[in-house]
């Protein structure tokens, strides 16, 4: 269970304050009740700090990734862990802190000299034909938003939807994320019945556009749960 994992001595690389060793300046504090630590823009107390359970990287903070806290651990128990700094080992881009990406298993700087061509080459090189993972969670391409000079067109590699041009969203495609069209009225959409189930999709659909929501198609109400078709419909 999550509690037993959190209580074990195997916890490595937890986000601040538990992961002060992860190299966040000023974040390593003693575990005395009431100590303050940075939580987003504000400060929170350490005495009620609880690691955040997650199913995928997007659920975590910008300087975190989602993984099992134990080495080679139970993939069913995942929490948000502090990102890896430059020259630290990695298995996917999301593990590296903003401004870095994962190349040949090491977090390297994604400064202005690294253009999209090299990033795409890295994706192919790192993930190539080997679609297995070392630790049971999916590899995800998360790139520093500093790398984008213009809004991404359809098919461009992205980090989040704001990296994409109007009418596009950032969605998973295999083990990277690309700009895809936001869904229009009547288009098939994905309704996630189980929390975290979208973490399993390798061809993620965009969300429904403005004024639309993903609802079961009226003539499919009689269908069995598994075959129900959802489409984008007006509110």
């Amino acid at each position: 269970t999550l509690n037993s994992v959190l209580n074990s001595n195997a916890i490595k690389n937890l986000p601040p304050p538990l992961g002060g060793a992860a190299g966040h300046p000023g974040s390593a504090v003693s575990a005395a009740p009431g100590i303050l630590y940075p939580g987003g823009n504000k400060y929170q107390t350490i005495d009620n700090y609880q690691p955040y359970p997650c199913a995928e990287d997007e659920e975590c903070g910008t300087d975190e990734y989602c993984a099992s806290p134990t080495r080679g651990g139970d993939a069913g128990v995942q929490i948000c862990l502090a990102c890896r700094k430059r020259r630290k080992r990695c298995m996917r881009h999301a593990m590296c802190c903003p401004g870095n990406y994962c190349k040949n298993g090491i977090c390297v700087s994604s400064d202005q000299n690294h253009f999209r061509g090299e990033i795409e080459e890295t994706i192919t090189e790192s993930f190539g034909n080997d679609h297995s993972t070392l630790d049971g969670y999916s590899r995800r391409t998360t790139l520093s938003s500093k790398m984008y000079h213009t809004k991404g067109q359809e098919g461009s590699v992205c980090l989040r939807s704001s990296d994409c041009a109007s009418g596009l969203c950032c969605a998973r495609h295999f083990w990277s994320k690309i700009c895809k069209p936001v869904l229009k009225e009547g288009q098939v959409c994905t309704k996630h019945r189980r929390k975290g189930s979208h973490g399993l999709e390798i061809f993620q659909r965009c969300y429904c556009g403005e004024g639309l929501s993903c609802r079961i198609q009226k003539d499919h109400h009689q269908a069995s749960n598994s075959s129900r078709l959802h489409t984008c419909q007006r509110h």
């Epitope: 940075p38 939580g39 987003g40 823009n41 929170q44 609880q50 975590c60 948000c80 969300y207």
Partner: nanobody, 129 residues
Amino acid sequence: EVQLVESGGGSVQAGGSLRLSCTASGRPFDDYAMAWFRQAPGKEREFVAAISWSLSRTHYADSVKGRFTISRDGAKNTAFMQMSSLKPEDTAVYYCAAAPRPKWVSVQYFSTSANYEYWGQGTQVTVSS
């Protein structure tokens, strides 16, 4: 200018339902959590529900679990809260708020009002017995 505008408040009998909407404008909110807080007369503002930037995670105050449902529209700039089985103690001004995705997220992040950068003006919900 960033604005959060709430709507959908009103008066309802105990056991009834209301649906609150919050429309955000002035910037993209796809990297923000959106939440509802409420404040009853003479009481402190309290957390009600939140939905994360990833859309997959929702958080609720114990007092509303199973009765209220928070959601966001596909384009992510509108949040909704479906309130059912309303009780007189749900009477309050309901505020919509938006919190940026932090560097490090904890279980408490969503319920801590200090983390919310943008706030609406509020909408009144009155539940009579």
